[in-house]
Interface confidence: low
């Protein structure tokens, strides 16, 4: 028999069946070409010294033989005595070693067996009912296929899978999706109603991330707050990069799981937007106040996790960059304004309050007056800080309000608010001898030194009331105490002490007498 | 001939447990998914849960956290672990497989005959 031809004779060996397990296997037969076919099969086991003998049985009954040495592949023509436009069977037996092993057969026509493609080009991944579903276009005149899946993720080997039967211009199929590993997953395609025609080749990979992106394990930093008022937010440890099965592990796009920050600004409610999200790598600055950041994983599927931090409000405050003065008519605070056309942020809440919610005012974007300050006003009827304690007042800045990470702190600061003058006025003034020309006087803090930074000093009015000489001492802002000398025996003395800010002298606490008593020596 | 069996229902008090058991026999392939469905009188079949070859599990939001689908190869076995089961859990309880998935999910070409059970408050 010619080698290119199939030898209608019986093979030359003896048909004893192996009965094991391995062999040859997944035979395939296709067209190739008008007048050119192939088959192709794998085989499992050693391979030396095995035979290989591609049989085939026609419609006829009559059946024959190509040989083909150790190769598994095999292309033969139409003239080669198999009939292409009928049903045959085809099936491999590999001799060696007087023994026979056979592969399942196929029974197909040869004419119509074309060898498909893959799905190709774009396909498509959505969650449907916790289930993975994937979409492609059907390859060109190749309607009517049987579609296999196999998947894979970075710890387990491949699982095979059956997508059913196709019969339209697209094509789509159901697969396991993972909660919390990613997968890779590859198609192929083959004739829909011929068992034996042969499988594609695999599809290339579609990478498929867990349906629960990962909780993102970051770390932040926030720098100090700049002289521009600003302080930068930094990164000190990157998300974990998720597992990824072999064939995802190139620039696979599918898989990839994105972070995003969404920054809170917790102060200043009254502004126009107080959350922003933006990309994890374009780390924010921040402007002194207090905010919630949070760390938003999502993949093709959605958001996943999020992890959450709180940066408080930077508390460093500057006591002298406030000027704020009271009039008939009400209060202006003053203070050094920024650029042209900024919009400030007012906001004031009682020390000690800091749980309840701050009051805010925002400005119309004002220019800097002559002596270059910018200024917030308000009537007494208003009542803004109108009681008597103290309040804690931040000014925050901004060119371009509606944006988030554009804000600025101006001044951190405290004051006291309502009639300061007389509710600052020291209380339990009292007078203790210290020595024979010395006494001791005493007084209670006043409640301006509860706002830090607001009280600037003590002074204590000693008047002689005999000559009616007065001296005045001052005296730093911790102490409550102070010893006055070079006192005369037997003179009445008033004392009387008040507390001042910077802006404001105080009112003078009740006059309290007293005198030193004459030593009468024995 | 596939044939699939199911055991493990009755009637129970609100808040306990039962294990429903569903036996195959007959299948030849290996690559099947594996579920249950519940139908009660008046009512759309219900599905409540799935297994998959490879592991996977889907459920019902209204059994998610409660019932457990599991499966053993070896016996051609799947089990429902139902435990804090309410009176709205009463139903016939039938286990399903399919071997073919098509665009629309698995199709459960081969069904059991369906177990009965009962939640009383």
């Known amino acids: 028999c010619r080698t290119s031809e199939c030898c209608f004779q019986d093979p030359p060996y003896s048909d004893a069946d192996s009965g094991s397990a391995s062999g040859p296997r997944d035979l395939s037969c296709y067209r190739i070409s008008s007048a050119g076919y192939e088959c192709s099969w794998q085989y499992e086991g050693p391979t030396a010294g095995v035979s290989h003998f591609l049989r085939c049985c026609l419609s006829s009954g009559r059946c024959c033989y190509f040989a083909t040495g150790s190769a598994t592949r095999l292309q033969f023509s139409d003239q080669a005595g198999v009939s292409v436009l009928h049903t045959v069977t085809l099936w491999v037996e590999s001799w060696a070693r007087n023994r026979t092993e056979k592969s399942p057969e196929v029974t197909l026509q040869l004419y119509k067996s074309v060898k498909y493609k893959p799905p190709l080009g774009d396909i498509k991944v959505s969650k449907l009912a916790g289930q993975l579903r994937m979409e492609w276009e059907t390859p060109d005149n190749q309607v009517g296929a049987e579609v296999q899946f196999r998947h894979r993720t970075p710890s387990s080997s491949w699982k095979l899978g059956d997508c059913g039967p196709q019969d339209d211009d697209t094509e789509s199929c159901l697969c396991p999706l993972e909660m919390n590993v990613a997968q890779e997953f590859q198609l192929r395609r083959r004739r829909l109603g011929s068992q034996g025609s042969s499988w594609s080749k695999w599809s290339s990979p579609v990478c498929v991330p867990p349906e629960n992106p990962p909780q993102p394990q970051v770390r932040f930093s926030v720098e100090q707050l700049g002289r521009d008022g600003r302080r930068r937010l930094t990164l000190k440890e990157q998300p974990t990069q998720l597992e990824l099965p072999e064939g995802c592990q190139g620039p696979a796009p599918g898989v990839e799981v994105t972070y995003q920050l969404q920054l809170h600004m917790l102060s200043c409610p009254c502004k126009a937007k107080a959350t922003r999200t933006l990309p994890l790598e374009k780390m924010p600055y921040l402007s002194g106040a207090a905010y919630n950041v949070a760390v938003i994983s999502s993949n093709r599927f959605g958001p996943g996790p999020n992890q959450t931090w709180h940066i408080p409000a930077d508390t460093h405050t500057e006591p002298v960059a406030l000027n704020i003065s009271v009039g008939t008519n009400g209060t202006t605070m003053y203070w050094p304004a920024r650029a042209q056309s900024t919009t400030y942020c007012i906001e004031w809440q009682p020390v000690g309050q800091e749980g309840s919610l701050a009051t805010c005012n925002l400005t119309a974007p004002q220019d800097p007056d002559p002596a270059g300050m910018a200024t917030y006003s308000w009537s007494r009827e208003s009542g803004a800080m109108g009681q008597e304690k103290c309040y804690h007042i931040t000014i925050f800045a901004s060119a371009h309000p509606k944006k988030l990470t554009l804000w600025s702190t101006v001044l951190s600061t405290y004051h006291f608010g309502g009639n300061a003058s007389a509710a600052g006025t020291p209380h339990h003034v009292s007078v203790k001898n210290h020595s024979l020309d010395s006494v001791s006087v005493d007084w209670a803090p006043s409640l301006l030194s509860t706002c830090p930074g607001v009280l600037k000093e003590y002074v204590v009015r000693c008047r002689d009331e005999d000559s009616n000489q007065v001296s005045e001492h001052p005296v730093q802002p911790t102490e409550t105490q102070v010893t006055l000398s070079d006192l005369r025996a037997g003179v009445a003395y008033t004392v009387q002490v008040r507390a001042d800010t910077a802006w404001l002298r105080g009112a003078w606490s009740q006059p309290q007498r007293f005198s030193i008593k004459v030593q009468v020596s024995d | 001939q596939v044939q699939l069996v199911e055991s493990g229902g009755g009637a129970v008090q609100a808040g306990g447990s039962l294990r429903l058991s569903c036996a195959a026999s007959?299948?030849?392939?290996?690559?099947?998914?594996m579920a249950w469905f519940r139908q009660a009188p008046g009512i759309e079949r219900e599905f409540v849960a799935s297994?998959?070859?490879?592991?996977?599990?889907y459920y019902a939001d209204s059994v998610k956290d409660r019932f457990t689908i599991s499966r053993d190869n070896a016996e051609n076995t799947v089990y429902l672990q139902m435990n804090s089961l309410k009176p709205e859990d009463t139903a016939v309880y039938r286990c399903?497989?399919?071997?073919?998935?098509?665009?629309?999910?698995?199709?459960?070409?081969?069904w059991g005959q369906g177990t009965q059970v009962t939640v009383s408050s």
């Open positions: 399903a497989v399919g071997t073919k998935i098509g665009t629309m999910g698995p199709r459960y070409d081969y």
């Open positions: 007959g299948l030849t392939s290996r690559h099947y998914v």
């Open positions: 297994i998959w070859w490879g592991g996977s599990t």
